[in-house]
Interface confidence: low
């Protein structure tokens, strides 16, 4: 360049470059002043005369040094779903993001294109990874001992309350339901657990951890900011052991002697034997066995399978499809064996509670006056369905009941016939909604 | 006991590579998000990647995005950094930490890498 | 240059209530939880507070967090000689891929 300033246009020298905002025009074989951002050139440049730039107008934007003919125009109008985060001014162009409670599911060089509703989860599930800006949220299976009863895409699980008494047991969807004394938050052993109170959340992404309640498995569970519960179900557990029990030997004495009185009249008696069992569950079945769907037979002990379930928890927690299940946005995930689970729940509404379990066969003989030779039915009802014991994730095409609602004592003027006829097995479903195919 | 056990670290130069191994045992791994945080010597904890359950989503700190790659085999109960082109910037002590809904409650006791020539 | 910031350094006698801080934007703690770890030295960090104000079983009620707009803050009360460590703020930032950001920490003394 010469020494002086040289003013546009210019020449360039052999070889050399136009300077900065500054353009070398191939038609003038000058270096020409560039235009400002938010202005556009309206004249190129000439041998003799320099750019000549203008104002971009409304709804159109520049924003570096240019020479461009005509501004650029500004992106369409926000969507419904967006926020308009950068407004269109002369130097920029408009930047939508999405707006709270939707993200970013396809995004373009600058703000976003396309929005997405946040998922939201349904009661049973609980957020496991909030959502972000660009990523949706992620949902997963509320494990025993906690629940969500709301769909949305900021609650977690929660701890079922505790129970001195248990009017309702708890499930994955619904929180336990106590009896006149005040309740306290579970708190299972042996691990960091997190509190979970329930949440009511303003911000749209709102994590919090998600429970799991497999003992030294989770950190994040129910502790919290008031003091730990001492409360637990466990301290029930004998005495209403002890009911059960008694309950039985009464049944079954009344069964006896009506057997016996029969005998003693010269009457044949028809016994209808059914059994009633408050199971011993081996661990891979505890987590089916529990729920809403649940027949108490003996309804008197409400509580009497609420316990000792802290061991069943740990092994079927290895099995729960927390996080991993693709999902389409806006939808729920089919999360199969996992989700049946979740949707059964568990009423064990005190992780931590070792109580004894009690295992109760309750053998009722119901006989009527028949002087057909004596029948006997035996049925054992109390198999448990598992909807969370395939490795595969399908649930099983069966549907086992919980239990059978027995009709123990009938007319006598019921025939053999029409009693045995009634002895048929109807199976109850699960009450597993939605429990579809877990993805590979 | 739940725990996580990191191994790997050690000296190496500019430019060289490393894998860092973080053995998981005590819950069920395949249900969790794992990260891998670092801390350089006397300074803060960053986070470095992490990974979501099945290994099919990926995230990483800018300046080690091209260089390190997270991993894991759910079958070993295992997750891997494999940490290339090294850098000094790189020297930290490096945490395998499992991740609870964006909170990390287990935390590995950390395992050093020195790159330096 | 850590996203969240807080002060390097806090302290307190034995017995007092100290307050850490910690500082974002609306893209991270303004709309997301925010999380505290305890760093002893020469261990590894522990989860102290999680979602803004709940405690892990173990943790002391002496701790407590909160959060308001986009900043929060860790109480200390009941200051304790054990308590002399580092602090760190944790949370999501909506804006960033990886989305988890740290706080620089805050080196906290017990005088006395």
């Known amino acids: 360049l010469p020494a002086q300033v040289a003013f546009t246009p210019y020449a360039p020298e052999p070889g050399g470059t136009c300077r900065l905002r500054e353009y070398y025009d191939q038609t003038a074989q000058m270096c020409c002043s560039k235009c400002p951002p938010g202005q556009h050139a309206k004249v190129f440049c000439t041998k003799t005369s320099d750019t000549v730039c203008d104002s971009c107008e409304d709804s159109t934007y520049t924003q570096l040094w240019n020479w461009v003919p005509e501004c650029l125009s500004c992106g369409s109008r926000c969507s419904s779903d967006q926020v308009e985060t950068q407004a269109c001014t002369r130097e920029q162009n408009r930047i939508c993001t999405c707006r709270p409670g939707w993200y970013c599911a396809l995004s373009k060089q600058e703000g976003c294109r396309l929005c997405a509703q946040l998922r939201k989860c349904r009661p049973g599930f609980g957020v496991a990874r909030p959502g972000t800006e660009t990523s949706d949220v992620v949902c997963k299976p509320c494990a025993p001992g906690t629940f969500s009863n709301t769909t949305s895409s900021t609650d977690i699980c929660r701890p079922h309350q505790i129970c001195h008494v248990v009017a309702i047991p708890g499930n994955a969807s619904m929180d336990a339901v106590c009896t006149s004394t005040s309740p306290t938050r579970s708190m299972a052993p042996g691990a960091v657990h997190l509190p979970q109170p329930v949440s009511t959340r303003s911000q749209h992404t709102q994590p919090t951890p998600a429970p799991s309640t497999a003992p030294g498995t989770s950190f994040l569970l129910p502790v919290g900011p008031s003091p730990p519960a001492e409360g637990s179900t466990g301290d029930i557990v004998l005495p209403v052991g002890l009911i059960v029990g008694v309950t039985a030997l009464g049944l079954l004495i009344i069964g006896v002697v009506n057997c016996v009185i029969m005998t003693q009249v010269k009457k044949k008696p028809l016994c209808l034997q059914r059994e009633t069992k408050v199971p011993h569950l081996p661990a891979d079945k505890a987590r089916g066995a529990q729920g809403p769907e649940q027949q108490h037979l003996l309804t008197t002990v409400p509580s009497s399978s609420s316990s000792s379930l802290e061991s069943s928890a740990s092994a079927l927690d290895r099995r729960a499809p927390t996080r991993n299940q693709p999902q389409a946005p806006g939808a729920e995930k089919a999360s199969g064996a996992g989700e049946a689970r979740a949707s059964t729940g568990s009423s064990d509404s005190s992780p931590g509670g070792h109580g004894t379990q009690v295992n109760v066969t309750c053998i009722v003989n119901v006989c009527s006056s028949s002087d057909h030779s004596s029948q006997c039915s035996s049925q054992a009802s109390s198999t448990m369905g598992d909807t969370d014991a395939s490795p595969s994730g399908s649930p099983k095409d069966e549907q086992v009941p919980f239990s059978k609602e027995e009709c123990a004592f009938r007319s006598q003027l019921e025939t053999p016939e029409t009693l045995l006829g009634s002895t048929e097995e109807k199976p109850l479903p699960l009450g597993v909604p939605d429990a579809g195919m877990k993805p590979s | 006991e739940v725990q996580l056990l990191e191994s790997g670290g050690g000296l190496v130069q500019p430019g060289g590579s490393l894998r860092l191994s973080c053995a998981a045992s005590?819950?069920?791994?395949?249900?969790?998000?794992m990260s891998w945080v670092r801390q350089a010597p006397g300074k803060g904890l960053e986070w470095v990647a992490n990974?979501?359950?099945?290994?099919?989503?990926?995230y990483y700190l800018d300046s080690v995005k091209g260089r390190f790659t997270i991993s894991r085999d759910n079958s070993k109960n295992t997750l891997y950094l494999q940490m290339n082109s090294l850098r000094a910037e790189d020297t930290a002590v490096y945490y395998c930490?499992?991740?609870?809904?964006?909170?990390?409650?287990?935390w590995g006791q950390g395992t050093l890498v020195t790159v330096s020539s | 240059q850590s996203v969240l910031t807080q002060p390097p350094s806090a302290s307190g006698t034995p017995g007092q209530r100290v307050t850490i801080s910690c500082s974002g934007s609306s893209s991270n703690i303004g709309s997301n939880t925010v999380n505290w770890y305890q760093q002893l030295p020469g261990t590894a960090p522990k989860l102290l507070i999680y979602d803004n104000n709940k405690r892990p079983s173990g943790v002391p009620d002496r701790f407590s967090g909160s959060k308001s707009g986009t900043s929060a803050s860790l109480a200390i009360s009941g200051l304790r000689s054990e308590d002399e460590a580092d602090y760190y703020c944790q949370s999501f930032d909506r804006g960033l891929s990886g989305s988890i950001v740290f706080g620089g920490g805050t080196k906290l003394t017990v005088l006395g």
């Open positions: 930490a499992r991740e609870e809904y964006g909170a990390f409650d287990i």
């Open positions: 990974i979501n359950t099945d290994g099919s989503e990926k």
């Open positions: 005590g819950f069920t791994f395949s249900d969790y998000y």
